[in-house]
Amino acid sequence: APTSSSTKKTQLQLEHLLLDLQMILNGINNYKNPKLTRMLTFKFYMPKKATELKHLQCLEEELKPLEEVLNLAQSKNFHLRPRDLISNINVIVLELKGSETTFMCEYADETATIVEFLNRWITFCQSIISTLT
């Protein structure tokens, strides 16, 4: 059974992930980003189901494409280079989903824009956090 300290750690990691995803969304989804329209042409694959931490496997698999899109943005949009930002997110995702169980991600038929993709994972984080508090 999860201890209160492990629950607290999970909550903090989710909050960190949430803030990173929100920062990316705010950095790209505004009219001051001249590459927004170009970024919206990139396809992202969405999870068929995202209700548990193991489903973060689906996010992990889309981090490389996410980095490619973020490379189009000006560095001033974020406080870190895309490579470092994605690396940080990857570390959190690996810790949260755990590496001891292998989970095969199932993707939905519908693809999404980067904005829809980020909003989906932001909602996921918020949902899990709410169950922990």
Partner: antibody, heavy 119, light 108 residues
Framework: QVQLVQSGGGVVQPGRSLRLSCAAS????????MNWVRQAPGKGLEWVTL????????YYADSVKGRFTTSRDNSKNTLYLQMNSLRAEDTAVYYC????????????WGQGTMVTVSS | SYELTQPPSLSVSPGQTATISCSGD??????AYWYQQKSGQAPVLVIY???RRPSGIPERFSGSSSGTMATLTISGAQVEDEADYFC???????????FGGGTKLTVL
Amino acid sequence: QVQLVQSGGGVVQPGRSLRLSCAASGFTFSNYAMNWVRQAPGKGLEWVTLISYDGSQKYYADSVKGRFTTSRDNSKNTLYLQMNSLRAEDTAVYYCARDSTTLGAFDVWGQGTMVTVSS
Amino acid sequence: SYELTQPPSLSVSPGQTATISCSGDAFPRKFAYWYQQKSGQAPVLVIYEDTRRPSGIPERFSGSSSGTMATLTISGAQVEDEADYFCYSTEPTVAHPIFGGGTKLTVL
């Protein structure tokens, strides 16, 4: 209604210059990145250049880099394309086009203006 | 350089289904968009993000994408659908806009 009205086309000799204008109305011009797209007679569409909402960032197709300059005057709601060292292959209908902020394409186009480069 | 490949022309009778293809290596990771351009007019967006239809575009226009191929379908083509159709996307790396060569649709 949302509109882009173009002016400034015409016939020009190779090596000479020409400036196109695109007047925007019906939307907050300063909130949108803008583009120029061209179409040679009987041919397909070719993206030419993009300018950011405030004019600070500009991107060009390789075919016009160093010869064409895009600019904007947000106080006049107007987009410009300065074309220098014109070549016969620049002969085309030139369209100004607005970048959509919600989908990855151009959502509003000007009526087009013909530029003919000929001696 | 990256290219989007379309058939140059297609002819259908009124009421028939017109299917226009667009091939691009990046389509598994890029959305396809479709513009209609009638003679002497500016292009009009008829499909975005592979399958979505802008408001005001008739339901007979639909889009799909699978692998490296995007498709525009006009179910029950009408005489007023006669136009050039261009697929559009962006390059895989720098994401500069790119158009297909266009398909001239004749409805007669």
